[in-house]
């Protein structure tokens, strides 16, 4: 039995930050779980981990230097990524694993979300336009 995951096909991070919501076909209430976000077609980089259980508050961490936070819903985890770089534009996959109660459950691989990180462009202010062309 596998959990199904839904995520937006594409998100644009205009301000180098993005909220990526992972929606599950499973209620996480009073479960011990590990939700994670993975970067790349091969999911080689674990971007962020959200760990939750019935007796502790949510714990969020990244071992790979990403600035991330997480929020828990009954059937979702939302990852908030900040300080993203343009070269971190990639496909990102949600993963969910339920550790307790048994049996261990995880998800069918989702379609992923392409996060397109837009660089901050410094545009000339309309009050101070650049030198006019002759």
């Amino acid at each position: 039995n596998k959990i199904l995951v839904k995520q937006s096909p594409m998100l644009v991070a205009y301000d180098n930050a993005v909220n990526l919501s992972c929606k599950y076909s499973y209620n996480l209430f009073s479960r011990e779980f590990r939700a994670s976000l993975h970067k790349g077609l091969d999911s080689a980089v674990e971007v962020c981990v959200v760990y939750g259980n019935y007796s502790q508050q949510l714990q969020v961490y990244s071992k790979t230097g990403f600035n991330c936070d997480g929020k828990l819903g009954n059937e979702s985890v939302t990852f908030y990524l900040q300080n993203l770089y343009v070269n971190q534009t990639d496909i990102y996959f949600c993963k969910i694993e339920v550790m307790y109660p048994p049996p261990y459950l995880d998800n069918e691989k989702s379609n992923g979300t392409i996060i397109h990180v837009k660089g901050k462009h410094l545009c000339p202010s309309p009050l101070f336009p650049g030198p006019s062309k002759p």
């Epitope: 590990r34 760990y51 071992k63 230097g65 550790m99 307790y100 048994p102 995880d106």
Partner: antibody, heavy 120, light 107 residues
Framework: QVQLVQSGAEVKKPGASVKVSCKAS????????IHWVRQAPGQGLEWIGC????????NYNEKFKDRATLTVDTSISTAYMELSRLRSDDTAVYFC?????????????WGQGTTVTVSS | DIQMTQSPSSLSASVGDRVTITCHAS??????LNWYQQKPGKAPKLLIY???NLHTGVPSRFSGSGSGTDFTLTISSLQPEDFATYYC?????????FGGGTKVEIK
Amino acid sequence: QVQLVQSGAEVKKPGASVKVSCKASGYTFTSYYIHWVRQAPGQGLEWIGCIYPGNVNTNYNEKFKDRATLTVDTSISTAYMELSRLRSDDTAVYFCTRSHYGLDWNFDVWGQGTTVTVSS
Amino acid sequence: DIQMTQSPSSLSASVGDRVTITCHASQNIYVWLNWYQQKPGKAPKLLIYKASNLHTGVPSRFSGSGSGTDFTLTISSLQPEDFATYYCQQCQTYPYTFGGGTKVEIK
């Protein structure tokens, strides 16, 4: 209380295999990885690999990938490390230890160690 | 693999001394570093996790600091039971690797 209890000392001949067990108690077995670490006489600590009992996924140190096999029997909360084609430089104390699967930060509980001696 | 280099490999100190052990990682491991104490014939014991967090039951004379590639374990006032070997370990990426150890001996 939380405990990891390992099997007893073994003496093996070069070329043979050894299988060390590690019985866990006092915690939810499927919430933690079991790692294996060895220590040759007078030497430092060397990580062999780990297994997660929930889905039986393993990670191995490349050095041991072709000779070490990590398994678990969740029904009796026991992990096993089998090392094949033993050589004299495999003589060491082998420890099992655990790290949390959700918060994989450290090895907080260790077995007492199993001495494996390889000698002809 | 990430190489962990500990220094010194051994040191002699007296009870009451302040002792500092350093650990260098061959690449950025952020805060993913632990310190263990091991006595002869025994299994290692966790002292510090995530660079600076004291494990439950460990005396407050032990402290850890650092991030990135350089880390320090400090014993503020060495006690007789602290004579042992200390190891750093990175848990940022597999394979997890240990430093070579620092043996703290009685002067």
